[in-house]
């Protein structure tokens, strides 16, 4: 019950995250730079990983895609594949972990199958949840380290003066959904993979014996059932049986002079 | 290189009509708010009538209902219509705008100006 409860519950962490993944990246607001008021209108600039958006006090917005940008960072466009290889990840990962799932019967499969189906599942989560949490953190280590504009720029370019608007960038909420989903992502994947662990046919910790009646006159070693079972004092798997019982590996053996003790 | 370039100025009787066109050149990505300033001889420099990308539009309260201000957002280029002129119009008027080269990202804007075109109100 509890593997089933774990499992169920990795998958829900890691539906809910990878959900927020997908959303992350489609979001514009990965960097905002600070409001500034222009004579005309308040105007506020955001941008994501795909265009960038200006939202004006009149609650217009038009966003433009990047690709009339020329020469895009090769920094963004690894956080945008390290993106886009945790949702493919996730994706595959779910579709697995359905299959795997304890509570769907699907043909005979065994508890081998699914144990074997969590852990790859769990293991995508994870890897998933590490590419969204990469990807989010090489972009916010990005607008720290390149692209804060304490002071405004002014020069004479041709045609008149030049000077730069925005003071600085700062996170959007993207990278929190990011961050966020990221985590829970990953949070599901480790449950996936100790659900596994449950779900996996455990050894059995004693041998299992196999009788052969050698006759009428069969002589029991006192003990009952737990004696006959591999239980209780018999702990060394010593012979049960004065006549014809052996333990399966024994089979086909020879007596030895260990046979009887 | 980005530049802004003013033109349709000249001399005009008062009473009489300019119309005013700037023409944003160079790799532009996008253009937030386009305005038309001007500078007197001996005043400072001041905000005739401005429009944003989503059509808002300000304008001074000494230009109201003379001056009509329109930009054309597929062709990057603002216009002002100037009506009534009266001598107190005479200035050099400058383009400005608040655009982002295709060469920066993350976007950044920065505020152009154009060199000016004079405009004179004069019998």
């Known amino acids: 019950m509890a593997v089933t409860a774990c499992q169920g519950l990795g998958f829900v962490v890691s539906l809910i995250g990878i959900a927020g993944i997908i959303a992350a990246t489609c979001m514009d607001q990965w960097s905002t730079q600070d409001l500034y008021n222009n004579p005309v209108t308040a105007v506020f600039n955001y941008q994501g990983l795909w265009r960038s958006c200006v939202r004006e006090s009149s609650g217009f917005t038009e966003c433009r895609g990047y690709f009339t940008l020329l020469g895009l960072p090769a920094m963004l466009q690894a956080v945008r594949a390290l993106m886009i290889v945790g949702i493919v990840l996730g994706a595959i990962g779910l579709l697995v972990s359905i299959f795997a799932l304890k509570c769907i019967r699907i043909g005979s499969m065994e508890d081998s199958a699914k144990a074997n189906m969590t852990l790859t599942s769990g293991i995508m989560f994870i890897v998933s949840g590490l590419c969204a949490i990469a990807g989010v953190s090489v972009f916010a280590n990005m607008l720290v380290t390149n692209f804060w504009m304490s002071t405004a720029n002014m020069y004479t370019g041709m045609g008149g003066m030049v000077q730069t608007v925005q003071t600085r960038y700062t996170f959007g909420a993207a990278l929190f959904v990011g961050w966020v989903a990221g985590g829970l992502t990953l949070i599901g994947g480790v449950m996936m993979c100790i659900a596994c662990r449950g779900l996996a046919p455990e050894e059995t910790n004693y041998k299992a014996v196999s009788y052969h009646a050698s006759g009428h006159s069969v002589a029991y070693k006192p003990g009952g059932f737990k004696a006959s079972t591999g239980f209780g004092s018999n702990t060394k798997n010593k012979k049960i049986y004065d006549g014809g019982a052996r333990t399966e590996d024994e089979v086909q053996s020879y007596p030895s002079k260990h046979d009887y003790v | 290189e980005v530049q802004l370039v003013e033109s349709g100025g000249g001399l005009v009787q008062p009473g009489g009509s300019l119309r005013l066109s700037c023409a944003a050149s160079?790799?532009?990505?996008?253009?937030?708010?386009m305005g038309w300033y001007r500078q007197a001889p001996g005043k400072q420099r001041e905000l005739v009538a401005g429009?944003?990308?989503?059509?808002?539009?300000r304008y001074a309260d000494s230009v109201k209902g003379r001056f009509t201000i329109s930009r054309d957002n597929a062709k990057n280029t603002l216009y002002l219509q100037m009506n009534s002129l009266r001598a107190e119009d005479t200035a050099v008027y400058y383009c400005?705008?608040?655009?982002?080269?295709?060469?920066?990202?993350?976007?950044?804007?920065?505020?152009?100006w154009g060199q000016g075109t004079l405009v004179t109100v004069s019998s």
């Open positions: 400005n705008a608040d655009l982002a080269t295709s060469y920066s990202w993350p976007v950044r804007y920065l505020e152009v």
């Open positions: 160079g790799s532009i990505f996008s253009i937030n708010v």
């Open positions: 429009i944003s990308t989503g059509g808002t539009t």
